[in-house]
């Protein structure tokens, strides 16, 4: 199957790698601006020169293009505790990344939030925490798994999942909510 | 306690438009973030806008941009959703939450108001 491609695609393709079709005349190929710049006004003729102007502050293109515009410079988003890895240059957007020992959480695929790395108290790092991935942990005996924190077993509930992990304390439990103590 | 009460949902045909309400109770709502999401039949929590404690700070999912508005009234302690434009694939049940502080999850969000967008 052809992918099906899109009207500047299309036009692209006409001209050699680096080059677009002029958008009034499709018998002239234009060099595309380097990053860091826009299109400003289309080359003249074959062989002239693209005009080609850098982008302003707080905007960028961060590859060759030939775009009216420079694309808007990315903010880091503080009410998700994101913090700036990099600041934003004519050819690079912004980076925003999260503090040390906390991980990125995508709540979509252009939203992410930082949460603290488990600690792993009342078990043990089974994976330590990375830069998209919180903590594993193994829980010691008489905890189980809630949230990613180690839960003592005597928090453990009939309907929960965790009767597996807790047998012989829910059965402790069960025996003294039968007999009516707290 | 914590309470979150969402309403305002409803039945509309594709292009009509509905606001949503969220009557918080229980926690200074005016120092916190508060989120908007929705679960469509058979599909899993999808972010679909949040706004920050003075309300300056807003983001949208990109299926929404351009025709949901998050506001919120700190006074009357409510958190709103305008939406407009309406969409057969915008039914869902939506929620008010709190942004989650502890990890990827909600401790605390409302029981949910159901939008139907149907012909």
């Known amino acids: 199957l052809v992918p099906h491609l899109g009207d500047r695609e299309k036009r692209d393709s006409v001209c050699p790698q680096g080059k677009y079709i002029h958008p009034q005349n499709n018998s002239i190929c234009c060099t595309k601006c380097h990053k860091g710049t826009y299109l400003y006004n289309d080359c003249p003729g074959p062989g002239q020169d693209t005009d080609c102007r850098e982008c302003e502050s707080g905007s960028f293109t961060a590859s060759e293009n030939h775009l009216r515009h420079c694309l808007s410079c990315s903010k880091c988003r503080k009410e998700m505790g994101q913090v700036e890895i990099s600041s934003c240059t004519v050819d690079r957007d912004t980076v925003c990344g999260c503090r040390k020992n906390q991980y990125r959480h995508y709540w979509s695929e252009n939203l992410f939030q930082c949460f603290n790395c488990s600690l792993c108290l009342n078990g043990t790092v089974h994976l330590s925490c990375q830069e998209k991935q919180n903590t594993v942990c193994t829980c010691h005996a008489g905890f189980f798994l809630r949230e990613n924190e180690c839960v003592s077993c005597s928090n453990c509930k009939k309907s929960l999942e965790c009767t597996k992990l807790c047998l012989p304390q829910i059965e402790n439990v069960k025996g003294t909510e039968d007999s009516g103590t707290t | 306690e914590v309470q979150l009460l969402e309403s305002g949902g409803g039945l509309v045909q594709p292009g009509g438009s509905l606001r949503l309400s969220c009557a918080a109770s229980g926690f200074t709502f005016e120092n916190k973030t508060m989120v908007w999401v929705r679960q469509a039949p058979g599909k899993g929590l999808e972010w679909v806008s949040h706004i920050d404690a003075t309300g300056t700070i807003t983001y949208y999912a990109d299926s929404v941009e351009g025709r949901f508005t998050i506001s919120r009234d700190n006074s009357k302690n409510t958190l709103y959703l305008q939406m407009n434009s309406l969409r057969a694939e915008d039914t869902a049940v939506y929620y008010c939450?709190?942004?989650?502080?502890?990890?990827?999850?909600?401790?605390?969000r409302g029981q949910g108001t159901l939008v139907t967008v149907s012909s």
């Open positions: 939450a709190l942004l989650p502080k502890r990890g990827p999850w909600f401790d605390y």
